[in-house]
Interface confidence: medium
């Protein structure tokens, strides 16, 4: 059984205000069973951006069909970016349980927001 890796290939992404940002994340194994969640920031102050199992998250859509059992692409698109969205985004795998427990994190992608072109 292959060891799970969380691949966030972009160190940083720069998006103009009002546009959409695509944050890439793929996983290399379906095990352990459990959801993927996206957070902005790390530590206790981190903000949940997307949870595969709950919602809705009105500005967030998944790039691929995450409900398919064999899906390994958990990239997300965040619409209508504002300066408040700037920060480092982490794609995190949780192990199924009561409650689910954090298993492994991607390296993070820093989102910077440029002024809207005039």
């Amino acid at each position: 059984e292959e060891e799970l890796q969380i691949i966030q290939p972009d160190k940083s992404v720069s998006v103009a205000a009002g546009e959409s940002a695509i944050l890439h994340c793929t996983i290399t194994s379906l095990f352990p069973v459990g959801p993927i969640q996206w957070f902005r920031g790390a530590g206790p102050a981190r903000v949940l951006i997307y949870n595969q199992r709950q919602g809705p998250f009105p500005r967030v859509t998944t790039v691929s069909e995450t409900t398919k059992r064999e899906n390994m692409d958990f990239s997300i698109s965040i619409s209508n970016i504002t300066p408040a969205d700037a920060g480092t985004y982490y794609c995190i795998k949780f192990r199924k349980g009561s409650p689910d427990t954090e298993f492994k994190s991607g390296a993070g992608t820093e989102l910077s927001v440029r002024a809207k072109p005039s």
């Epitope: 691949i7 290939p9 972009d10 160190k11 890439h24 390296a107």
Partner: antibody, heavy 119, light 108 residues
């Protein structure tokens, strides 16, 4: 202009150790992830190791894991590769390579230093 | 680990001819692919990143294309200084960062 200058290569016997250095200039060294890449005689390029700008994140190729140690001294703008338990198959030119600040490709490379492991 | 396979191993052409080099990935790397040029005694040089973006100072006779698993480096009209070894590198699936085996472009 970015400059990367490797040193420390030489001829050693199997099982011996060697420490490579890479002196960097022309950029803010601590802001960039750095890598070692090697090329055995007549072979292609092989990634060896990566260290983040802060030194907190480190990765190794399976072929060197447990034998090689990457480190950096940001106050001296220098990258290191400590190579222990050297084997004949470690014979190669070792390049120091600076990563792009957004992606993991290599913007700049040194000229390399040759390591020969032979009995 | 993503394996990159370059073809052909050697390309024998004359100055002024067009060179087409191919790099195939064992799984999708989207457009996270770079090309490098290597000459004896010189540091490898970044040519292309993001599959198709030319690095600073690279002449426009060099172009890259492709996405997913198949990528191409094209040199539209070979100059004497272009005879070298070319490597592709993926930076989607990492670590390890992986390189192709190289294509040698030599003078006919």
């Amino acid at each position: 202009d970015v400059q990367l200058v490797e040193s420390g290569g030489g001829v050693v016997r199997p099982g011996e150790s060697l420490r490579l250095s890479c002196a960097a200039s022309g950029f803010t060294f601590s802001s960039y992830d750095m890598n070692w890449v090697r090329q055995a005689p007549g072979e292609g390029l092989e990634w060896v190791s990566l260290i983040s700008g802060s030194g907190e994140i480190i990765y190794y190729a399976d072929s060197v894991k447990g034998r090689f140690t990457i480190s950096r001294d940001n106050s001296k703008n220098t990258l290191y590769l400590q190579m222990n338990s050297l084997r004949a198959e470690d014979t190669a030119v070792y390049y120091c390579a600076k990563e792009n600040n957004r992606y993991r490709f290599f913007d700049d490379w040194g000229l390399g230093t040759l390591v020969t492991v032979s009995s | 680990e993503t394996v990159l396979t370059q073809s052909p191993g050697t390309l024998t052409l004359s100055p002024g001819e067009r060179a087409t080099l191919t790099c195939r990935a064992s799984q999708s790397v989207y457009t996270y692919l770079a090309w490098y040029q290597e000459k004896p005694g010189q540091a490898p040089r970044l040519l292309i990143y993001g599959a198709s973006s030319r690095a600073t100072g690279i002449p426009d006779r060099f172009s890259g294309s492709g996405s997913g698993t198949v990528f191409t480096l094209t040199i539209s009209s070979l100059q004497s200084e272009d005879f070298a070894v070319y490597y592709c590198q993926q930076y989607y699936d990492r670590p390890p960062l992986t390189f192709g085996g190289g294509t040698k472009v030599e003078i006919k």
